[in-house]
């Protein structure tokens, strides 16, 4: 009976999400493997988040709006482990917008989701950021490693969206 009611709840939750995400990929989690954590297909999952790499070339603001329509934001990177996971799926000759910007050019970097910008957990390439006119951040492959660079926000780039996993 308990299992039945849990399944009914899950199905109604799935139906609720189906209007936003036609397909979800779910895995069983929790100590009793009773919880399901889901990401929209074909997003990838890491820890408690889902990630989507957009190959559409758009400005930073348009990229953020595009993520927002999908219930996400441009990616906020909190740890080296998270960055290492994300970069496994990136092309080394491409650049991708992050959810990091400095709209006034005052070198006051801010994450789109209001996560505090911690200078100690940043992965700027050597010598970056280097221009107050370059107010948006990308991640790219340079000098044999992935790192961040400041670029012009209006110049189209690929992008990475991030959202919280859906728990059902």
């Amino acid at each position: 009976n308990f299992m039945y009611s849990k399944t009914v709840k899950r199905l109604s939750k799935l139906q609720e999400y189906q209007q936003y995400y036609p397909s979800l990929t779910c895995v069983m989690e929790g100590k009793d493997m009773e919880d399901w954590s889901c990401c929209p297909t074909p997003w990838t999952s890491f820890q408690s988040s889902c990630y989507f790499i957009s190959t559409v070339m758009q400005s930073w603001t348009k990229s953020q709006n595009n993520c927002s329509v999908m219930g996400a934001d441009l990616v906020v990177i909190n740890t080296k482990e998270e960055q290492d996971f994300i970069t496994q799926n990136l092309k080394i000759n491409s650049a991708y917008f992050l959810g990091l910007s400095d709209p006034k050019g005052w070198r006051h970097w801010q994450w789109v989701d209001q996560t505090p910008y911690n200078k100690n957990v940043t992965f700027w390439h050597s010598g970056e950021p280097n221009s107050p006119d370059e107010r948006c951040a990308i991640i790219n492959f340079r000098s044999e490693e992935w790192g961040w660079n400041d670029v012009h926000c209006h110049v189209p780039q690929k992008s990475i969206c991030k959202m919280k996993k859906i728990y059902i």
Epitope: Q58, S59, T61, N65, P103, S131, D133, V151, H154
Partner: antibody, heavy 121, light 111 residues
Framework: EVQLVESGGGLVKPGGSLRLSCAAS????????MSWVRQAPGKRLEWVST????????YYPDSVKGRFTISRDNAKNSLYLQMNSLRAEDTAVYYC??????????????WGQGTTVTVSS | DIVMTQSPDSLAVSLGERATINCRAS??????????MHWYQQKPGQPPKLLIY???NLESGVPDRFSGSGSGTDFTLTISSLQAEDVAVYYC?????????FGGGTKVEIK
């Protein structure tokens, strides 16, 4: 006083080339992105190319990509536009404009007087 | 590309009267509180001159009879009391993404 003075315009045959120059004074040229904007007779303004302050980025619309090349010489406070394979539709007044960044983009705060390019056989 | 549509194409206003020019973008040129729309004035035989940046910020040295407003896709330039020296063509321009694009212009004349 900010001054931008264009030169190099003239009459050229279709398929020909021209090199426009813009001499800048009254400001620290190397600190600013610069653009070329053109205006065909009786038409709206059309952006032609942009170069960032550090020379690291150049951008062009599809209409001129592969034919026009923007460059700058910060030591000479000069901006250039090399125009090859010119077409009749490139006929316009070409303005050099200084960019000012505002939030996520830029606007043009100073413009030169313009130089006229006429492409005709 | 973002298409900028200005209206009207031309406008005849009496001296001292209000002139209103509209500009519509084919998609939003705002992001949160940033409105990436700018206005220029062009007199015959002269280059464009910046009037308003960021939809509503008056450029230094521009008379305060000029003002701008709007957000998203719809923006307005207002001349509160038209002066003879305001006879010109006025252009809007978006810069939220490359390529920056301009409106077709609105010619303002004295009635």
């Amino acid at each position: 006083e900010v001054q931008l003075v264009e030169s190099g315009g003239g009459l050229v045959k279709p398929g020909g080339s021209l090199r426009l120059s813009c001499a800048a004074s009254g400001f620290t040229f190397r600190s600013y992105g610069m653009s070329w904007v053109r205006q065909a007779p009786g038409k709206r303004l059309e952006w032609v190319s942009t170069i960032s302050s550090g020379d690291s980025y150049t951008y062009y619309p599809d209409s001129v990509k592969g034919r026009f090349t923007i460059s700058r010489d910060n030591a000479k406070n000069s901006l250039y536009l090399q125009m090859n394979s010119l077409r009749a539709e490139d006929t316009a007044v070409y303005y050099c404009a200084r960019q000012i960044y505002y939030d996520y983009a830029y606007y043009f705060d100073f413009w030169g007087q313009g130089t006229t390019v006429t492409v005709s056989s | 590309d973002i298409v900028m549509t200005q209206s009207p194409d031309s406008l005849a206003v009496s001296l001292g009267e209000r002139a209103t020019i509209n500009c519509r973008a084919s998609e939003s040129v705002s992001f949160r509180t940033s409105h990436l729309m700018h206005w220029y004035q062009q007199k015959p035989g002269q280059p464009p001159k910046l009037l308003i940046y960021g939809a509503s910020n008056l450029e230094s040295g521009v008379p305060d009879r000029f003002s701008g407003s709007g957000s998203g896709t719809d923006f307005t330039l207002t001349i509160s009391s038209l002066q003879a020296e305001d006879v010109a063509v006025y252009y809007c321009q978006q810069s939220i993404e490359d390529p920056p694009t301009f409106g077709g212009g609105t010619k303002v004349e004295i009635k």
